[in-house]
Interface confidence: medium
């Protein structure tokens, strides 16, 4: 049967929810399926279900909730049905379902270089998604960055920063890097997905060194 | 004030490519959906793409799936159509269009409220 | 895909004349209709959303209904400038169809 598979805001000031749509062999035909939602004004739900208000827009299998259909201080309750049978149903309320979209413009600058010039720290930075209202306050996101050797499959992981820059130390030079960074809105929904990956190669030891002019 | 406006029509030979433009004004094209529907010379209406930028998706008519890209860049309020693999029945004027869901929370479905005035798209040897 | 069948695919009306055109669709679409006017060279225009609701600016003459999968736009006086062709259109999945439309036409 079709099942809810996910509810996502990108910045708290829309929403979409996706569902299965798979017809399993042996199973009954089902009907065109529909989603209604309902939401709870101060203490009681309104009884009163509608229907998805945008079908379109998030893509097949989808309702979306635009800016004037998406309130964050309201609970919603939605669910899926078909043939007036009611197959799927979940509530949530909108912070609850924050997943920004991934951090934009990464890059990087050298720090510092270990005196033996095998080490060296650098500061990673980048942008909080296009979309997510920082300077008003409207969203407050956390960072997560990981890193790796290019050739390596685990990844390592820093903890979670509310800054858009954060040093990485002791790297190894001669080798290239993998650097990513993901977001979540703070105290509440998942994190995103994450950025673009960026390709930090460290130069070699002599062009770290300062070459003496001998005369 | 809302506008749309095309642009990147001309002739093309078959098998070639073109890249339409959709520059939007008065609206955030990341909050909106855009699509593409065109129109062959004294023919109907017929939808292409859509493209929703906030919930990452696109979509695509049949009769161009694998041939035709949509996509937007947020940060330009424009949205664009890649045409590749052009066919002779792809000759039509191409509109862009805003998909609106209107802001009664209890009033559904929405609807393509703001087009743009449409550009040539010629496919012939 | 869901499809929009409209009929007539033309018509002759007068000035003042009541013109109803009707689309069915192939299965379910709620109420997820809209109904456009367009002229010859120019992009079309909407008048009427989910089935029945009127589009800011158009006359009140333009009014929608649905009955079940039938859905109606009337003009309930034909002026002048109605002359055109009216197309329907489903958005109750990604993938929008639209009608083969109807051209009205001075009798």
């Known amino acids: 049967e079709p099942k809810f598979t996910k509810c996502r805001s990108p910045e708290r000031e829309t929403f979409s929810c996706h569902w299965t749509d798979e017809v399993h062999h042996g199973t009954k035909n089902l009907g065109p399926i529909q989603l209604f939602y309902t939401r709870r004004n101060t203490q009681e739900w309104t009884q009163e279900w509608k229907e998805c208000p945008d079908y379109v827009s998030a893509g097949e299998n989808s309702c979306y909730f635009n800016s004037s259909f998406t309130s964050i201080w309201i609970p919603y309750c939605i669910k899926l049905t078909s043939n007036g049978g009611t197959v799927d149903e979940k509530c949530f309320s909108v912070d609850e379902i924050v997943q920004p979209d991934p951090p934009i413009a990464l890059n990087w600058t050298l720090l510092n270089v270990s005196l033996t010039g095998i080490h060296a720290d650098i500061q990673v930075r980048w942008e909080a998604p296009r979309n997510a209202d920082i300077q008003k306050g409207w969203m407050v996101l956390e960072y997560e960055l990981q890193y790796k050797e290019v050739n390596e499959t685990k990844w390592k992981m820093m903890d979670p920063i509310l800054t858009t820059s954060v040093p990485v130390y002791s790297l190894k030079v001669d080798k290239e890097y993998e650097v990513r960074v993901r977001s979540k809105q703070r105290n509440s929904g998942n994190y995103g997905e994450f950025s673009e990956v960026l390709y930090v190669t460290l130069p070699q030891m002599s062009q770290f060194t300062c070459e003496e002019d001998f005369y | 004030e809302v506008q749309l406006v095309e642009s990147g029509g001309g002739l093309v030979q078959p098998g070639g490519s073109l890249r339409l433009s959709c520059a939007a004004s008065g609206f955030n094209v990341y909050y909106s959906s855009i699509h593409w529907v065109r129109q062959a010379p004294g023919k109907g209406l017929e939808w292409v793409a859509s493209?929703?930028?906030?919930?990452?998706?696109?979509s695509y008519a049949d009769s161009v799936k694998g041939r035709f890209t949509i996509s937007a860049d947020t940060s330009k309020n424009t949205a664009y159509l890649q045409m590749n693999s052009l066919r002779a029945e792809d000759t039509a004027v191409y509109y862009c269009?805003?998909?609106?869901?209107?802001?009664?929370?209890?009033?559904?479905?929405?609807?393509?409220?703001?087009w743009g005035q449409g550009t040539l798209v010629t496919v012939s040897s | 895909d869901i499809q929009m069948t409209q009929s007539p695919s033309s018509l002759s009306a007068s000035v003042g004349d009541r013109v109803t055109i009707t689309c069915r669709a192939s299965q379910s679409v709620s109420s997820a209709v809209a109904w456009y006017q367009q002229k010859p060279g120019k992009a079309p225009k909407l008048l009427i959303y989910s089935a029945s609701s009127l589009y800011s600016g158009v006359p009140s003459r333009f009014s929608g209904s649905r009955s079940g999968t039938d859905f109606t736009l009337t003009i309930s006086s034909l002026q002048p400038e109605d002359f055109a062709t009216y197309y329907c259109q489903q958005s109750s999945s990604s993938l929008i169809t639209f009608g083969q439309g109807t051209k009205v036409e001075i009798k």
């Open positions: 269009a805003r998909y609106n869901s209107w802001g009664i929370w209890w009033r559904p479905f929405g609807a393509l409220d703001y």
């Open positions: 493209i929703s930028s906030s919930s990452g998706s696109t």
